[in-house]
C-alpha cells in the first residue's frame, strides 16, 4: 500500500480520484473549504468535499449496497429459480406419461372404448396439470367427471355392445346411475384420495418454491433508506474528503453500520428458517400417496382394475340399470363375455410397486440439502456484505467514520454516529412495507406447509395399502375390494430417470405394451427403454 501522502494543500488528489466517479471537476474544490454545507461527511477542519460530491457519494453508496445485496443472493436465487422450473417441467412430464400410460391401457385392452376414452382421459389430465399450477379446480369433481364420462361408453360398448341406436339416449341416466349404484366400487374414491393428496402436496411444493423466488427478488431490489445511505457514505467515502484514499473502514464499524442498514431485512430470518424447515418436512412426507409421480404413473392400473370390477358385475348391473333407465325392453342382448382370468383375484392384490433410481424424490431431497445451506442467509447478510466490501483486517489503522484510528472502538464510533443520526432509531423504524408484506406471505406459506395433511407421527407400514388393508385382505364388502390387479405387481421402473430424460416425451403409439393385445399385468411397464 502506498505511503500516506503529505497534507493536500490543493485537493489535487481528491479531484483526481473523484473523476473516477464523475467526469469533470466542477464539483470539487480546488483548495480545502470549510464544508459548512456538508450533511454527512462533517469535517473537523477544512475539507476537499462539496455538497454535490457528498450527494454523488451517497448515490454511489446506495447503488453499491444494492449491487452487493444482489451478488449475495445470486447463488440462492439461481438455485430456487432453476429448481422451480425443473420441477414444474418434470411434473408436466409425469402428467404426460400418466396420460399416455392410461391411453395405452385403453388401446391395448379396450379398443372399442377409444377414441372417447382418449378424450375423457385427456380432459382429466389437463385438469390435473391446471390444478398443479394453481387453478381453482376440485379434484373430486375431476375424478367424478372422468368416471361419469367413462361409464356410459363402457356400458354401451362393453356391457351391451349390441344396443340399438334408439337406446343410446340414456347417457345422462347412466351418468347418474354410475354414482348411485357405485358401479366402479370404491375405485373412484381411492383415486380421489390418492390424486387429491398427491396433487395438493405437489401444488404447495411449487407454490413454496415460487414464493422463495419472490422473497429473494424482494430483498434483492430493496431501496435503502436515506439514513442508511448516509451511514454507508460515511463509512466508505467520507475518508476521501480528508485525502485518505488508501484507508479502509474498520471491520467492527462496518458490522455496526450493516446491522443498522439491514435491520428490516434481517427480520425475515426467523420466517425464512421456518420456511426451509417446513419445506423439508413437506418433502420428507412426499412418498406413496403423497408422491404424485407414484400416484399418477400407477393410475392406469387402478382405472383398469375399476373397469374389470364393472365387467365382473356386468350381469347384475345390466339388470338394475335396465330398470333404472327405463329401457328394460331392450335388455335382451346378452352382456359381453369376459374370461374369468380377468377378474380380480382378491388374494393377490398388490399396490403398484415403484423402483426408484434418480427420481423426482431424490432430486427434491437434494434441493432441500442445498437450501439448508442457506438457512442463515438473512441473519448472515450483514457479515457477508462486510466481508465482500473493503474493510481493514484486524480493525487496525482504519476509518471509523470520523477519522483514521489505530484501533476501532465501537463505543467511540457509536458516539460519533449519534451526532448525525441515531442508529437505534434506524433499527426501531421497523421493516419496509415490502419486507412486511413478504414476511406475511412467508407466514402464510409456512402455515400451509405445516398444516398439509401429511403422514405424521407414524411411518406407514410398507405392507399396508392406502386404505390400511394388508395385501390380500379386503374390507367387509368383498365386491369393494381395491388395489393393483393381476397375479403380481405392476412395476413402474425408474419412474423418471430424472434429469437425463427430462425432455423425453412418450407418444401413445410408443407406450408400453402396444406390441401385443395384453393386459398391463403381462407387461413390465418401463418408462424408458434402457
Amino acid at each position: 500500500q502506498p505511503p500516506p501522502p503529505p497534507p493536500d494543500a490543493t485537493c489535487h488528489q481528491v479531484r483526481s480520484f473523484f473523476q473516477r466517479l464523475q467526469p469533470g471537476l466542477k464539483w470539487v474544490p480546488e483548495t480545502p473549504v470549510p464544508g459548512s454545507d456538508l450533511q454527512v461527511c462533517l469535517p473537523k477542519g477544512p475539507t476537499c468535499c462539496s455538497r454535490k460530491m457528498e450527494e454523488k457519494y451517497q448515490l454511489t453508496a446506495r447503488l453499491n449496497m444494492e449491487q452487493l445485496l444482489q451478488s449475495a443472493s445470486m447463488e440462492l436465487k439461481f438455485l430456487i429459480i432453476q429448481n422451480a422450473a425443473v420441477f414444474q417441467e418434470a411434473f408436466e412430464i409425469v402428467v404426460r406419461h400418466a396420460k399416455n400410460y392410461t391411453n395405452a391401457m385403453f388401446k391395448n385392452n379396450y379398443p372399442s372404448l377409444t377414441p372417447q376414452a382418449f378424450e375423457f382421459v385427456g380432459e382429466f389430465f389437463t385438469d390435473v396439470s391446471l390444478y398443479i399450477l394453481g387453478s381453482d379446480i376440485n379434484v373430486d369433481d375431476m375424478v367424478n367427471e372422468l368416471f361419469d364420462s367413462l361409464f356410459p361408453v363402457i356400458y354401451t360398448q362393453l356391457m351391451n355392445p349390441g344396443l340399438p341406436d334408439s337406446a343410446l339416449d340414456i347417457n345422462e341416466c347412466l351418468r347418474g346411475a354410475r354414482r348411485d349404484l357405485k358401479v366402479f366400487g370404491n375405485f373412484p374414491k381411492l383415486i380421489m384420495t390418492q390424486v387429491s393428496k398427491s396433487l395438493q402436496v405437489t401444488r404447495i411444493f411449487l407454490q413454496a418454491l415460487n414464493l422463495g423466488i419472490e422473497v429473494i427478488n424482494t430483498t434483492d431490489h430493496l431501496k435503502f433508506s436515506k439514513d442508511c445511505g448516509r451511514m454507508l457514505t460515511r463509512m466508505w467515502y467520507c475518508s476521501y474528503c480528508q485525502g485518505l484514499m488508501m484507508v479502509k473502514p474498520c471491520g467492527g464499524y462496518c458490522n455496526v453500520v450493516m446491522q443498522g442498514c439491514m435491520a428490516g431485512v434481517v427480520e425475515i430470518d426467523k420466517y425464512w428458517r421456518e420456511y426451509i424447515l417446513s419445506l423439508e418436512e413437506l418433502v420428507n412426507g412426499m412418498y406413496r400417496i403423497y408422491d404424485m409421480e407414484n400416484v399418477l404413473l400407477g393410475l392406469f392400473s387402478t382405472i383398469h382394475d375399476s373397469i374389470q370390477y364393472v365387467q365382473k358385475n356386468a350381469g347384475k348391473l345390466t339388470t338394475t340399470i335396465g330398470k333404472l333407465c327405463a329401457h328394460s325392453q331392450q335388455r335382451q342382448y346378452r352382456s359381453a363375455y369376459y374370461p374369468e382370468d380377468l377378474f380380480i383375484d382378491k388374494k393377490v392384490l398388490k399396490v403398484a410397486h415403484v423402483e426408484h433410481e434418480e427420481t423426482l424424490s431424490s432430486r427434491r431431497r437434494e434441493l432441500i440439502q442445498k437450501l439448508k445451506s442457506f438457512i442463515s442467509f438473512y441473519s448472515a447478510l450483514p457479515g457477508y456484505i462486510c466481508s465482500h466490501s473493503p474493510v481493514a483486517e484486524n480493525d487496525t489503522l482504519c476509518w471509523n467514520g470520523q477519522e483514521l484510528v489505530e484501533r476501532y472502538s465501537q463505543k467511540a464510533a457509536r458516539n460519533g454516529m449519534k451526532n448525525q443520526f441515531n442508529l437505534h432509531e434506524l433499527k426501531m423504524k421497523g421493516p419496509e412495507p415490502v419486507v412486511s408484506q413478504i414476511i406475511d406471505k412467508l407466514k402464510h406459506i409456512n402455515q400451509l406447509l405445516r398444516t398439509m395433511s401429511m403422514p405424521k407421527g407414524r411411518v406407514l407400514d410398507k405392507n399396508l395399502d392406502e386404505e390400511g388393508f394388508e395385501s390380500g385382505d379386503c374390507g367387509d364388502d368383498e365386491d369393494e375390494c381395491i388395489g393393483g390387479s393381476g397375479d403380481g405387481m405392476i412395476k413402474v421402473k425408474n419412474q423418471l430417470r430424472f434429469l437425463a430424460e427430462l425432455a423425453y416425451d412418450l407418444d401413445v403409439d410408443d407406450a408400453p405394451g402396444n406390441s401385443q393385445q395384453a393386459t398391463p399385468k403381462d407387461n413390465e411397464i418401463s418408462t424408458f427403454h434402457n
Epitope: R20, L21, T60, L68, P390
Partner: nanobody, 116 residues
Framework: QVQLVQSGGGLVQPGGSLRLSCAAS????????MSWVRQAPGKGLEWIGS???????YYNPSLKSRVTISRDNSKNTLYLQMNTLRAEDTATYYC??????????WGQGTLVTVSS
C-alpha cells in the same frame, strides 16, 4: 490473501514509453474493475484510469491521450501502456483493485523515473 504483484518500470528516456504489468492472484480477477494510480515524489495520489471486467476503460482526462490500460483475464494480468513520457511522469505507479468504488488492494508499487 489477495495479491497484486507489479513488474516493469525503471529508467525511461523523455519521449519514451513504459509498459507495466500487474499479476493478480487469490481472487476472481475477471469479476473486478482494476485501476492504475500514481504518486509523484512528495505529492498526493493521482488516479490514472480504470478498466472494467468487461474490458471497457475510462481515464483521467489529463492523461487520456497518452495512456492505454488493458487486461488479460485468462492470465489474470493488468497492463499500463504510457507514451511520450515527460519528467513530471516520474512517480511510483500502483495497480489497485476496485471494490465498492474504492481501492481495496494495492500492488507493491513500481518506480518509474523519466530522465535523460
Amino acid at each position: 490473501q489477495v495479491q497484486l504483484v507489479q513488474s516493469g518500470g525503471g529508467l525511461v528516456q523523455p519521449g519514451g514509453s513504459l509498459r507495466l504489468s500487474c499479476a493478480a492472484s487469490y481472487f476472481d480477477f475477471d469479476s473486478y474493475e482494476m485501476s492504475w494510480v500514481r504518486q509523484a515524489p512528495g505529492k498526493g495520489l493521482e488516479w490514472i484510469g480504470s478498466i472494467y471486467h468487461s474490458g471497457s476503460t475510462y481515464y483521467n482526462p489529463s492523461l487520456k491521450s497518452r495512456v492505454t490500460i488493458s487486461r488479460d483475464n485468462s492470465k489474470n494480468t493488468l497492463y499500463l501502456q504510457m507514451n511520450t513520457l515527460r519528467a513530471e511522469d516520474t512517480a511510483t505507479y500502483y495497480c489497485a483493485r476496485v471494490n465498492m468504488d474504492r481501492f481495496d488492494y494495492w500492488g507493491q508499487g513500481t518506480l518509474v523515473t523519466v530522465s535523460s
